[in-house]
């Protein structure tokens, strides 16, 4: 004969535990039902009656099966530098993440407590580490043969154009100026931008190049004094 299914509340066998979605009530000394997500325990179980559950009130939630007497309060509304990526419902807390161009400087269990604007690299410096949802941009000086003429949290240093005849040599913050209208390199127009960090997915892809057999002439130019260590602006 099949074993008889025990209905809550019931006294567990010695040494055994309560089943999934049940909890052991110390007062009643019985296995009792938990409340489903979105509910809380309005009345605890006794030896003869099971847990009575009730729905969470507005702006409160429970995410797990539980027997808490009160639902948890949803977090406060998202600040102006944040976006709400998950609304407050009876079953889940509000989640605030940083808006594009910002990163989370102080995280909490879910979402972000404090957002800060991504550092912007000033001219002569480029992004050497893109910002992510949780980390700031790192700026580094443009290497010989490359430049950045922008103040940006996304632009990397780009190679100088190669001129048939150079009118003005390029430097770390300015591209070379050619006397002819046909520089020898073909490049996509405009500055190269790094993608802004995305809250919902980690961004991907950029590769790592390798070693040169011999340095190109661009690298043989005198390097001059090292630029200031801080290649960023606060805004």
């Amino acid at each position: 004969l099949p074993a008889q299914v025990a209905f809550t509340p019931y006294a567990p066998e010695p040494g055994s535990t309560c089943r999934l979605r049940e909890y052991y009530d110390q007062t009643a000394q019985m296995c009792c039902s938990k409340c489903s997500p979105g509910q809380h325990a309005k009345v605890f179980c006794t030896k003869t009656s099971d847990t009575v559950c009730d729905s969470c009130e507005d702006s409160t939630y429970t995410q797990l099966w539980n027997w808490v007497p009160e639902c948890l309060s949803c977090g406060s509304r998202c600040s102006s530098d944040q976006v709400e990526t998950q609304a407050c419902t009876r079953e889940q807390n509000r989640i605030c993440t940083c808006r594009p161009g910002w990163y989370c400087a102080l995280s909490k269990q879910e979402g972000c407590r404090l957002c800060a604007p991504l550092r912007k690299c000033r001219p002569g410096f480029g992004v050497a580490r893109p910002g992510t949802e949780t980390s700031d941009v790192v700026c580094k000086p443009c290497a010989p043969g490359t430049f950045s003429n922008t103040t940006s949290s996304t632009d990397i240093c780009r190679p100088h154009q190669i001129c048939n005849v150079v009118a003005i040599p390029g430097n770390a913050s300015m591209d070379a100026v050619c006397t002819s209208t046909s520089p020898t390199r073909s490049m996509a127009p405009g500055a190269v931008h790094l993608p802004q960090p995305v809250s919902t997915r980690s961004q991907h892809t950029q590769p790592t190049p390798e070693p040169s057999t011999a340095p190109s002439t661009s690298f043989l130019l005198p390097m001059g004094p090292s630029p200031p260590a801080e290649g960023s602006t606060g805004d």
Partner: antibody, heavy 118, light 110 residues
């Protein structure tokens, strides 16, 4: 002249650790990340990680997160890679480099051969 | 973990021909903003960075090398192969906080 000079070949037993060095000259080490990349015999390139000598911040490939430690000594313009719990699959040539993919500053060390054998 | 797949593994061509090498990201589209980089390795020589930012040639790299990105692929094109171009080529992609290399494409003389 920009140079990255790496330490000499190493032979180690499984389970041991090895510490490789890369001494740079011709540029300010704080201006560029130092990368470590390896190439096993007959295989492709594998990125181990990079270190920012300016502040010591590091980023590792997931496979090396627990076993590799990158450090720098800016007073001697030297970068270090320590790899622990060596196994035979770690037998490779290890390169330090300034090539970053963000910077176009394209210089590489001559490589250090590490052999792991019992 | 992200996987970067290069194809073909070996490409046999003659000098003067056009070479097209492909690199695919396992985690979604590779676009201009994803900064696919290409690196050349010749036996007994140092590595050489060719392309950065998906389509920018590194300083000193000849104009016959070009990069492009579309969908999940990024491509290195060598418009007219020179004898010195026969080598192994690697692409590498940045995945949020680390680089991943492809397995490489060996470009050999037919």
């Amino acid at each position: 002249e920009v140079q990255l000079v790496q330490s000499g070949a190493e032979v180690k037993k499984p389970g041991a650790s090895v510490k490789l060095s890369c001494t740079v000259s011709g540029f300010n080490i704080k201006d560029f990340y130092i990368h470590w990349v390896r190439q096993a015999p007959g295989q492709g390139l594998e990125w181990i990680g990079r270190v920012d000598p300016e502040d010591g911040n590091t980023e590792y490939a997931p496979n090396f997160q627990d076993r590799a430690t990158m450090t720098t000594d800016t007073s001697t313009n030297t970068a270090y890679l320590e790899l622990s719990s060596l196994r035979s699959e770690d037998t490779a040539v290890y390169y330090c480099s300034t090539w970053d993919g963000f910077s176009y500053f394209d210089y590489w060390g001559q490589g250090t051969t590490v052999t792991v054998s019992s | 973990e992200a996987v970067v797949t290069q194809s073909p593994a070996t490409l046999s061509l003659s000098p003067g021909e056009r070479a097209t090498l492909s690199c695919r990201s396992s985690t979604g589209p590779v676009t201009t903003n994803n900064y696919a980089n290409w690196v050349q390795q010749k036996p007994g020589q140092a590595f050489r960075g060719l392309i950065g930012g998906t389509n920018d040639r590194a300083p000193g790299i000849p104009a016959r090398f070009s990069g492009s990105g579309s969908g999940t692929d990024t491509t290195l094109t060598i418009s007219s192969l020179q004898p010195e171009d026969f080598a192994v080529y690697y692409c590498a992609l940045w995945y949020r906080n680390h680089w991943v290399f492809g397995g490489g494409t060996k470009l050999e003389i037919k």
